[in-house]
């Protein structure tokens, strides 16, 4: 059975997966695919590593941690509702039927946008700049200070800027509410 993880539209989704390398540099191939783990390999592969490197990836999918240390957790950037579904992390351990398989169910929820009769600058207080840097290891949210005063026309520009700079917009744990008045 699959284990459920949640993210909101526009956030980054984090799907944890780990293995213990037999020795540093003695890596095991890993594949990530959309859909439950089949008998062999991964269906609809979105990312793959071999004994040395990430040798295949598709746009918006990357490894948040250091796969050389056994952290093969997947980050999906700027998720949409279409990203919902089951993902397979398959640790391809040599030998017949030795693979470790993890089916992770990703549930995408609509973004929380609550209109409220507040002044424009309340956006700043309600929406501190929460970013996840593309560092090593499990996702960690850091507050980098509040945004300057911002108007509605700047919101999409800001979102694009955060996405394009790979400083991923990750409000997963912040519980922040965007108030537009």
């Amino acid at each position: 059975s699959e284990v459920e993880y949640r993210a909101e539209v526009g956030q980054n989704a984090y799907l944890p997966c780990f293995y213990t390398p037999a020795a540093p540099g003695n890596l095991v191939p890993v594949c990530w695919g959309k859909g439950a783990c089949p008998v062999f390999e991964c269906g609809n592969v979105v990312l793959r590593t071999d004994e040395r490197d990430v040798n295949y990836w598709t746009s918006r999918y990357w490894l948040n941690g250091d796969f050389r240390k056994g952290d093969v957790s997947l980050t999906i950037e700027n998720v949409t509702l279409a990203d919902s579904g089951i993902y397979c992390c398959r640790i391809q351990i040599p030998g017949i039927m030795n693979d470790e398989k993890f089916n992770l169910k990703l549930v995408i929820k609509p973004a929380k946008v609550t209109p409220a009769p507040t002044r424009q600058r309340d956006f700043t207080a309600a929406f501190p700049r929460m970013l996840t840097t593309r560092g090593h290891g499990p996702a960690e949210t850091q507050t980098l200070g509040s945004l300057p005063d911002i108007n509605l026309t700047q919101i999409s520009t800001l979102a694009n800027e955060l996405r394009d700079s790979r400083l991923a917009n990750d409000l997963r744990d912040s519980g922040a509410t965007i108030r537009i008045g």
Partner: antibody, heavy 117, light 107 residues
Framework: EVHLQQSGAEFMKPGASVKLSCTAS????????MHWVKQRTEQGLEWIGR????????KFAPKFQGKATITADTSSNTVYLQLSSLTSEDTAVYYC??????????WGQGTTLTVSS | DIQMNQSPSSLSASLGDTISITCHAS??????LSWYQQKPGNIPKLLIY???ILHTGVPSRFSGSGSVTGFTLTISSLQPEDIASYYC?????????FGGGTKLEIK
């Protein structure tokens, strides 16, 4: 054989800074995340933070951000924990440990830090 | 942060007993949970990782089970050398967090 050798006990005054060391043998620290864990007397374990010695990238528990700095010297296979603006709350045993990758399989013997005026 | 709630905080049992310690995560951590034993005056020692896998050299009377948010460490046929504190730890998300510990005593 894997071994983590930590520096000796420290007695410091409030407001001072201290730098603890942990030298690894039997493995290359570049192949692992290296962590520091705090344990106050008769209390539980508290994760401080970790470093990826490969590139120096660090992560910290929020309460130790600004208090702790973790560095690594790959040439000597050593990791360091620096604690600043010491108070009596920092009196504890500090362990260095390696993860593999998300659990701690080897631990140093611990360094006792006492902060007192 | 993911909170790890461990119970009981202390436990008294007789030699030969089977005891269980539970750990509850405040959110899904799949199987990315480890258990540690710390004997009085000693350093912590890894017992179990990935919720149920025994670390090398750990006696088979120790076992771990559970996934997602609920986990159990079971010690069967309690021995005198099992007197220790036991901690769970989640390694799925930073900051890593430990349970508050369970102090095991022999009656």
């Amino acid at each position: 054989e894997v071994h983590l050798q930590q520096s000796g006990a420290e007695f410091m005054k409030p407001g001072a800074s201290v730098k603890l060391s942990c030298t690894a043998s039997g493995f290359n620290i570049k192949g692992h995340y290296m962590h520091w864990v705090k344990q106050r007397t008769e209390q539980g374990l508290e994760w401080i933070g970790r470093i990826d010695p490969d590139d120096g990238a660090t992560k910290f528990a929020p309460k130790f951000q600004g208090k702790a700095t973790i560095t690594a010297d790959t040439s000597s296979n050593t990791v360091y924990l620096q604690l600043s603006s010491l108070t009596s709350e920092d009196t504890a045993v500090y362990y260095c440990t390696r993860s593999n990758p998300y659990y701690f399989d080897y631990w140093g013997q611990g360094t006792t830090l006492t902060v007192s005026s | 942060d993911i909170q790890m709630n461990q119970s009981p905080s202390s436990l008294s049992a007789s030699l030969g007993d089977t005891i269980s310690i539970t750990c509850h995560a405040s959110q899904n951590i799949n199987v990315w949970l480890s258990w540690y034993q710390q004997k009085p005056g000693n350093i912590p020692k890894l017992l179990i990782y990935k919720a149920s896998i025994l670390h090398t050299g750990v006696p088979s009377r120790f076992s771990g089970s559970g996934s997602v948010t609920g986990f159990t460490l079971t010690i069967s046929s309690l021995q005198p050398e099992d007197i220790a504190s036991y901690y769970c730890q989640q390694g799925q998300n930073y900051p890593y967090t430990f349970g508050g510990g369970t102090k095991l005593e022999i009656k």
